[in-house]
């Protein structure tokens, strides 16, 4: 019957396992008159046969490694051998079996690595080949370190990328390798096919000898540079050296300063390029980078520290044009009137900023001069000779000389003589009762007005009232602002109220003056008042520990890898359930109990990085309130995209016949990340047979020129295959085709007679 093994002539594809002796026919084609026989052409390799009656079969075992696809054509012929149907393509796909073992290209590898090399940066590749199909487990290779000799404290210093065979240092290796202690290591590496996952996998081993070399790429000692240097600039201050000659050095200013006064030359010598000012910036931290000829970093940057040493280049400055203090008329000798605090921009706690205070003039000198003294180093003014009388002299002006070791500055102080402070503030109410507020009451809200009065001289420190909460608010959730004209106190919320930690607070206020009370007068119960704050519960949403959570992983991490985690707490203490929102690519899942985030699909940096999703924390039980935070997953690039043409190049043509060899320029790109220097592709012809007619030459890292080698081309389309290699780790290669048509031209354009094929080239060379 027609069906799986027989039927009419039509394009078909058959899959046959290699290595199996023929056990049945492939297909029986049925002839429709006038067809009487069949003919087989194409890649038969004398294996595939069609009998005249249409029976297609193969006569011996196939070998995928010899040919993975046999492209055959079957035609139906009439009695005269003329094709009456077809030819139609018949594709035989040879399915792979694991009949080849992986083999290392070398039985021994040798390499060297510098101490402190970046962990994970490959310094050597081992490479094995397996003739089996790399698209199946049969040809998927898995590299492993079998043993490291010597092994110190059971710590692996080396690691291997099990897919690429790239050998690099582990974090411990980067930190601990020391050629003085151990200059060489030996690794035994195995490679298995079947992705290393099967008991039936084939394997091979190789030996790797590694020499550890000294790393002179080290951060120099911190540098001290005196500010305001008058020496000719630039001045060499330190140096860095890469391990090999030819490195290109640069400095990176992480702080993005408007003025960056340092430079580095191509020897690695670092200079300060202009005088520094410690008062502008007292220390600099920047980085020295060594790059290769292509602008790729050779190693991690070195941190350079420059401390700017102070010189005494700043005079003292007064706190304000006039500093005002008050003194009560009956104050006793030695009482503090106030402290004058001058400033000096030079370095703190050094002689350059150490200040001396001296009174140089008192006006008026009534009833005598020298009524005040100032502590030489502290700047505290004291009453020196006698009590003062407001009715005699209500105001004194002092000129005070403030000096450091080189500079002198005059500051002015006004001392107002005021009434004695013999009245205490008295609250108009001793108990302001109860106040009930919800815990989500806004910060800044005024919740209570309090009032005390003081009978002392108005608008002086004796009558001014300051309110303090002295009990019941250890968290500092409340504050009191005073109106200086009315002495009214406004109780405001400074921090969020919290039912869970303080449902009831018994608050005690104290009212006091900035001026001290006269001897014998004390604050009493009249200067105290209380009130009770009752906070009511509001069910609050869970709170995330961060607004944005961020994690960084390589784009090729295995499915199921933990890529980050989030945490939230519920104010009411309820359990929390985590979920994801906006995972548009279906890459992630979250453990709803722990908040750990895992990958569930292959990640792809080229699809967009960082990948942003929202995490939702929801109360379990209660009113199921939820809150949202961001999770940003930064994907680090791996070289997983082969180069391709940057645009569509159909429509290229040369006018036929060529009068002289011609050329055209094309551009390549790929989707991987190209830090620092952009792509660095290399170009070659895709097959040897093209070399008689064409040549390809590189212009730069992204562009190349395709040139004709002669002028003897037929008037037709040529498809030129070009191999583009990205030089990555591992290197990836793309084979692209440039269709170039040689055609008769009219006024510089391709001429096509009417009714000719479509797809006329439109770009002439």
């Amino acid at each position: 019957q027609e069906g799986k093994f027989s039927g009419p002539l039509k394009p078909m594809t058959f899959s046959i396992y290699e290595g199996q002796e023929p056990s049945q026919i492939i297909f029986q084609f049925k002839a429709n008159p006038p067809a009487v026989t069949f003919e087989l052409t194409g890649e038969t390799d004398n294996i595939f046969v069609i009998e005249r009656e249409g029976l297609l079969y193969y006569n011996r075992a196939l070998d995928r490694e010899t040919r993975s696809t046999h492209n055959l054509q079957v035609a139906a012929l009439d009695a005269n051998g003329i094709i009456v149907e077809g030819p139609v393509p018949i594709t035989i796909k040879v399915k792979d079996i694991n009949d080849n073992r992986p083999t290392f290209l070398q039985s021994k590898y040798e390499g060297s690595v510098r101490q402190n090399s970046r962990p994970g940066k490959p310094f050597l590749y081992v490479n094995a080949t397996d003739l089996d199909d790399p698209a199946t487990p049969n040809g998927q290779l898995y590299y492993q370190i079998v043993i490291q000799l010597p092994m110190i404290n059971n710590v692996m210093y080396f690691q291997i990328n099990n897919k690429t065979g790239a050998i690099s240092l582990t974090r411990e290796g980067s930190q601990e390798l020391n050629p003085a202690k151990n200059p060489s290591y030996n690794l035994v590496i195995s490679v298995k096919d079947m992705g290393g996952q099967s008991e039936n996998s084939f394997s091979d081993t190789t030996s790797v000898d590694i020499i550890v070399t000294e790393n002179i790429w080290k951060a120099p000692k911190p540098v001290e540079m005196v500010e305001n240097s008058t020496d000719p600039h630039p001045i060499k201050i330190t140096q860095v050296r890469w391990n090999d000659p030819g490195a290109q050095y640069s400095l990176v200013d992480k702080e993005k300063l408007p003025r960056f006064p340092f430079s580095i030359d191509q020897e690695g010598d670092i200079y300060v390029t202009q005088p520094l000012d410690r008062e502008e910036k007292d220390a600099y931290v920047f980085y020295a980078v060594a790059k290769d000829e292509y602008g790729k970093p050779l190693s991690y940057p070195l941190e350079i520290h420059v401390k700017v040493k102070d010189i005494n280049d700043n005079p003292p400055t007064c706190p304000s044009p006039v500093t005002v203090f008050e003194v009560q008329e009956n104050e006793r000798l030695g009482n503090s009137i106030g402290t004058l605090t001058a400033h000096d921009r030079d370095e703190e706690n050094t002689a350059n900023s150490f200040l001396n205070y001296r009174i140089v003039e008192q006006t008026p000198k009534l009833p005598m001069d020298g009524l005040f003294l100032i502590q030489t180093y502290a700047g505290m003014l004291q009453l020196a000779k006698q009590s003062l009388k407001k009715q005699d002299t209500p105001q004194y002006n002092l000129t005070i000389e403030v000096s450091d070791k080189d500079f002198k500055t005059l500051c002015f102080v006004q001392i107002n003589v005021i009434d004695i402070n013999d009245q205490i503030p008295i609250f108009e109410k001793s108990d302001y009762g109860n106040l009930t507020l919800a815990e989500d009451t806004n910060i800044g809200s005024t919740i209570l007005t309090i009032q005390a009065t003081d009978a002392d001289e108005p608008f002086t420190g004796s009558s001014k009232i300051l309110y303090h909460i002295i009990k019941g608010d250890s968290e500092g959730r409340l504050g009191v602002d005073t109106d200086p004209h009315t002495n009214t106190g406004y109780v405001i919320i400074k921090k969020p109220l919290d039912f869970e930690t303080a449902a009831v607070s018994n608050i005690v206020f104290k009212a006091e003056n900035p001026e001290p009370l006269v001897f014998g007068v004390k604050y009493n119960a009249s200067s105290f008042a209380k009130f009770t704050l009752i906070v009511t519960d509001v069910n609050e949403a869970p709170q995330f520990s961060q607004h944005v959570f961020q994690a960084k992983v390589s784009e090729d991490v295995a499915i199921g890898t933990k890529v980050g985690n989030v945490t939230a707490k519920d104010p009411e203490g309820l359990d929390i359930s985590y979920s994801l929102r906006g995972d548009t690519r279906g890459w992630l899942k979250i453990d709803h109990v722990t908040g750990e985030i895992f990958s569930v699909a292959p990640l792809d940096r080229e699809a967009g990085s960082p990948y942003r999703v929202q995490v939702v924390a929801t109360e379990v039980g209660g009113s199921s309130l939820s809150s949202v935070s961001e999770f940003h997953l930064i994907l680090m690039d791996v070289n997983d995209n082969p180069p391709r043409l940057a645009k569509d190049y159909t429509g290229l043509f040369f006018c036929h016949p060529l009068s002289a060899p011609g050329s055209l320029i094309f551009e390549a790109t790929d989707d991987d990340q190209h830090l620092f220097r952009g792509p660095h592709f290399t170009f070659s012809l895709g097959s040897g047979s093209l070399q008689n007619d064409w040549e390809v030459s590189k212009i730069n890292g992204t562009h190349a020129r395709l040139s004709t080698r002669h002028t003897e081309f037929e008037e037709r389309e040529y498809v030129v295959l070009i191999r583009i290699n990205d030089g990555g780790r591992p290197p990836l290669e793309g084979i692209v085709s440039l269709p170039v048509t040689f055609c008769s031209c009219v006024e510089g354009s391709c001429f096509r007679p009417a009714g000719h094929q479509t797809g006329i080239p439109t770009v002439g060379m």
Epitope: V36, T41, Q73, D78, A79, G81, I82
Partner: antibody
């Protein structure tokens, strides 16, 4: 051995018809196509068409459609060609020919039948 | 229709010498199976045509190996080395690639 025996010469008047035969022997008649070829005096060869007795498949050169009619009688292993509305242009020797089984070449030929159209 | 051209109506030759007869086609007779569908026939005076060469270069059974065929997809040559008297007649090329089959106009071999 393979033999193709054609009928004798014919003298016919303009406007008339003639039917010439080609009797096959020495092989299975239905297995092979029979071709007919025309040769005018002192001129080249022209392919008229073929008949495949197994299927009854017939293919004509467009130039001879309406002029020649090909038939076959499997019982007598004979192929026929009838020529209609004869004119002096149809005066020629007509050959039948058989293809080889695999290489599809006219290896076997009849001796030819001369047709003369004259009033 | 494919046009077969035999440019030389006749070629004179001395017995024992070699001679080449050419034929061209208006379309390539090379098919994707690698075969070139070109045949050579000899028609001796008063006889039916006789097959000499099939598929451009293959000698038909019973034909002396003095005859050989060669060519590309569109230009073909029949070569006779050491011509004998019995080789006289008209030589025709014919294409067998597609319908209608077509013959060349013939080249007459004459003995000097």
């Amino acid at each position: 051995q393979v033999l193709l025996q054609q009928s004798d010469a014919e003298l016919v008047k303009p406007g008339a018809s003639v039917k010439i035969s080609c009797k096959a022997s020495g092989y299975t008649f239905t297995d092979h196509a029979i071709h007919w070829v025309k040769q005018r005096p002192e001129q080249g060869l022209e392919w008229i068409g073929y008949i495949y007795p197994e299927h009854g498949t017939i293919k004509y050169n467009e130039k001879f459609k309406g002029k020649a009619t090909l038939t076959a009688d499997k019982s007598s292993s004979t192929a026929y060609m009838q020529l209609n509305s004869l004119t002096s242009e149809d005066s020629a020797v007509y050959f039948c020919s058989r293809l080889t089984n695999y290489f599809y070449v006219m290896e076997y030929w009849g001796q030819g039948t001369s047709v003369t159209v004259s009033s | 229709d494919i046009v077969m051209t035999q440019a030389a109506p006749s070629v004179p030759v001395t017995p024992g010498e070699s001679v080449s007869i050419s034929c061209t086609s208006s379309k390539s007779l090379l098919r994707s199976n690698g075969n070139t569908y070109l045949y050579w026939f000899l028609q001796r005076p008063g006889q039916s045509p006789q097959l000499l060469i099939y598929r451009m270069s293959n000698l038909a059974s019973g034909v002396p190996d003095r005859f050989s065929g060669s060519g590309s997809g569109t230009a073909f040559t029949l070569r006779i080395s050491r011509v004998e008297a019995e080789d006289v007649g008209v030589y025709y090329c014919m294409q067998h690639l597609e319908y209608p089959f077509t013959f060349g106009s013939g080249t007459k071999l004459e003995i000097k």
